[in-house]
């Protein structure tokens, strides 16, 4: 029997390598059965996840899954870091794994490095 718990499909240790100045959509895939839960995004600051208020968010519906999207328009160097989405469901909080944005400031990079280079070259990243 299929579980009717809310599930948030962000992979553990996932990351996105992106560039300052570009638009970017960070998606939180949400599986639910009857009522769509309230979902929020937060940004990790050490062990605390600070709720992101007043940001542009939207929902996208696909066949078996909904996506709660955090929009970066555009990406700023200060957007570098780890993010988590949370769902409020039956008075319980379900938290996703965190996903990390590695932001490269194109002004400081002579050419755009590959995704793997960026993930392994922390001196390109902003904290």
């Amino acid at each position: 029997k299929e579980s009717c718990d809310v599930q948030l499909y962000i992979k553990r240790q996932s990351y996105h390598s992106i560039f300052a100045g570009d638009p970017f959509k960070l998606e939180c895939p949400v599986k639910y059965c009857a009522h769509r839960p309230q979902v929020t995004w937060c940004k990790l600051n050490g062990t605390t996840c600070v709720k992101l208020e007043g940001r542009h968010t939207s929902w996208k519906q696909e066949k078996n899954l909904s996506f709660f999207i955090l929009h970066f328009e555009p990406v700023l160097p200060s957007d570098n870091g780890s993010y988590r989405c949370s769902a409020n469901f039956l008075s319980a909080i379900i938290e996703s794994h965190s996903t990390t944005l590695y932001v490269t400031d194109v002004k400081s990079a002579s050419e755009r490095p590959s995704k793997d280079e960026m993930a392994s070259r922390p001196w390109l990243l902003y904290s």
């Epitope: 948030l8 499909y9 992979k11 553990r12 996932s14 990351y15 062990t47 794994h97 965190s98 993930a119």
Partner: antibody, heavy 119, light 112 residues
Framework: EVQLVESGGGLVQPGGSLKLSCATS????????IHWVRQASGKGLEWIGR????????KYAASFKGRATISADDSKNTAYLQLNSLKTEDTAVYYC????????????WGQGTLVTVSS | DIQMTQSPSSLSASVGDRVTITCRSS???????????LNWLQQKPGKAPKRLIY???KLDSGVPSRFSGSGSGTDFTLTISSLQPEDFATYYC?????????FGQGTKLEIK
Amino acid sequence: EVQLVESGGGLVQPGGSLKLSCATSGFNIKDTYIHWVRQASGKGLEWIGRNDPANGNTKYAASFKGRATISADDSKNTAYLQLNSLKTEDTAVYYCASYEGYYERFGYWGQGTLVTVSS
Amino acid sequence: DIQMTQSPSSLSASVGDRVTITCRSSQSLLDRDGKSYLNWLQQKPGKAPKRLIYLVSKLDSGVPSRFSGSGSGTDFTLTISSLQPEDFATYYCWQDTHFPYTFGQGTKLEIK
């Protein structure tokens, strides 16, 4: 039925390259991380690296960085390991493993493929 | 890199025995989500490894309940409560909390 089937092993000359395939079925490869692990005869397991088939992001053990390339084609539900500049000490059984990325709900291993590096 | 040290390296035991294998990591395997990503694998000669336990203590589907895992931080244990003939194999711990992921050197469980 869940399956991971490696292929592409065999005899390779020192200095040569190999490309191994890992064909998966019974689950959506995009929901997983694909790992490549090797085992020399009579020895333990050695982690080579990991690929996220959903976006291509890859991590490698330091000793394989620059020599190994792990990739996946989610349309074929297949992952790949390319290893260059082969040495005799790369002789081993190479395994792919698929671990569910969200809730750790499964961790499947292929049967392995033997690579022999010899002149 | 995190070193994973298993003990003992080999072990002779009889059917029905209770067996304990330990795995010590050189640093904590506690991730920032509060979980330790420690797996136990079983490998029989000429066969692929098979995951038995994940997240320290969760049993994979179809794994007999005589297998159990415990521990936290840096010290972890695999226990087989009553050895069966099919349990004679090599067991590996594997951490996937920190990159690069690392394995213990293995514990070979043999029939006494």
